[in-house]
Interface confidence: medium
Amino acid sequence: MAHAGRTGYDNREIVMKYIHYKLSQRGYEWDAGDVGAAPPGAAPAPGIFSSQPGHTPHPAASRDPVARTSPLQTPAAPGAAAGPALSPVPPVVHLTLRQAGDDFSRRYRRDFAEMSSQLHLTPFTARGRFATVVEELFRDGVNWGRIVAFFEFGGVMCVESVNREMSPLVDNIALWMTEYLNRHLHTWIQDNGGWDAFVELYGPSMRPLFDFSWLSLKTLLSLALVGACITLGAYLGHK
């Protein structure tokens, strides 16, 4: 049977569910806007947040051949060219990415706490902060550890956005993450076995993913004339 991880999973679904998970860890609910369905350059619809435990996202229409409801599902833009069929993402991919991200943030909790306080997010600086960090993160190449760091960084940005009462930014961050995955990481992921390979690699025989020499990078902090966010990008990018 076809190896769905190599024909492709929907990166948007992977991003959206990861952000949902990260926000739900902090008690936030997120009704995603029409992320990914907006034409190029258009701002996505703002998300809606709630910290009410009983709040349930509105389900979107189910999609055959699999009955499926999710606030993550957004229709393709009208008239969009039909690309290769994307397979529904196996739960084990979402779960493994969650576990890897949780492992990553646990290991570097203090660093992430510092980063959160130094991001100084505003609606006007968020895109630049995101681009700078991600560019540094992958400057020396791509590996699964850096991809996990990418997801965790996006998650931190989303949590900080909500903490600072800028919840509409979350839809934007999700869109930027999806675009970056599709444009810059997709080929590497496919060439390296797809998300199924990530699931297999993040197994008992292959841990840890994060065999990074973090301590040596502490010295970079003293050279951080370019600002805390760029520093953090370099800090992650060498891992």
Epitope: M1, A2, H3, A4, G5, M16, K17, H20, Y21, S24, Q25, W30, T56, P57, P59, P65, V66, A67, R68, T69, S70, P71, L72, S87, P88, P90, P91, V92, H94, L95, T96, R98, Q99, D196, F198, V199, E200, L201, Y202, G203, P204, R207
Partner: antibody, heavy 121, light 110 residues
Framework: QVQLQQSGPQLVRPGASVKISCKAS????????MHWVKQRPGQGLEWIGM????????RLNQKFKDKATLTVDKSSSTAYMQLSRPTFEDSAVYYC??????????????WGQGTLVTVSA | QAVVTQESALTTSPGETITLTCRSS?????????ATWVQEKPDHLFTGLMG???YRAPGVPARFSGSLIGDKAALTITGAQTEDEAMYFC??????????FGGGTKLTVL
Amino acid sequence: QVQLQQSGPQLVRPGASVKISCKASGYSFTSYWMHWVKQRPGQGLEWIGMIDPSDSETRLNQKFKDKATLTVDKSSSTAYMQLSRPTFEDSAVYYCERGDYYYGSSYFAYWGQGTLVTVSA
Amino acid sequence: QAVVTQESALTTSPGETITLTCRSSTGAVTTSNYATWVQEKPDHLFTGLMGGTTYRAPGVPARFSGSLIGDKAALTITGAQTEDEAMYFCALWFSNHFWVFGGGTKLTVL
């Protein structure tokens, strides 16, 4: 430790909907998908569907798309399955099951004790 | 919808090695099917044994192992014990149907 406590047996009339509950404890409810499985007497298992409590995404076996509705209440860490317009073929034991994962592998790991639904006129 | 087929019944003796298989109607089973094995003992007691084709669930004895044999997923019990007598269900992930269970194998250990 992980526990899934299901509601008690139900006797329902054909056509009258029935709702089964599954209260989870001993873990972070939003971190794991909850699956529902059907077992008719003397027969095998049928996967009905699953729900991700973190965002209420639901995936249903096509066979059950007009039969089962899966919901969660995060405030009480409870998952629900409602069966609409039950017929005699819906008489079965229904299980909730929490998927587990361990470094890249998924398991049907933790099961509720089952809820017997009997459809009888 | 995909159909997953298992042997309906198998018999073995204590200490013997026995292999249960799981076939897909859609073609060869691959690692992308994340073959999962579940044991059912009397009174509806279910235990997850294997996941991701080859990974034992925590706490499961080392005599249980999972693999791909030819075009099928397989569960091998090396040195079967009397307490291994049970129903064994496999489940396969399909990208368009999600999880599908097999009909189950009744294993008797005489």
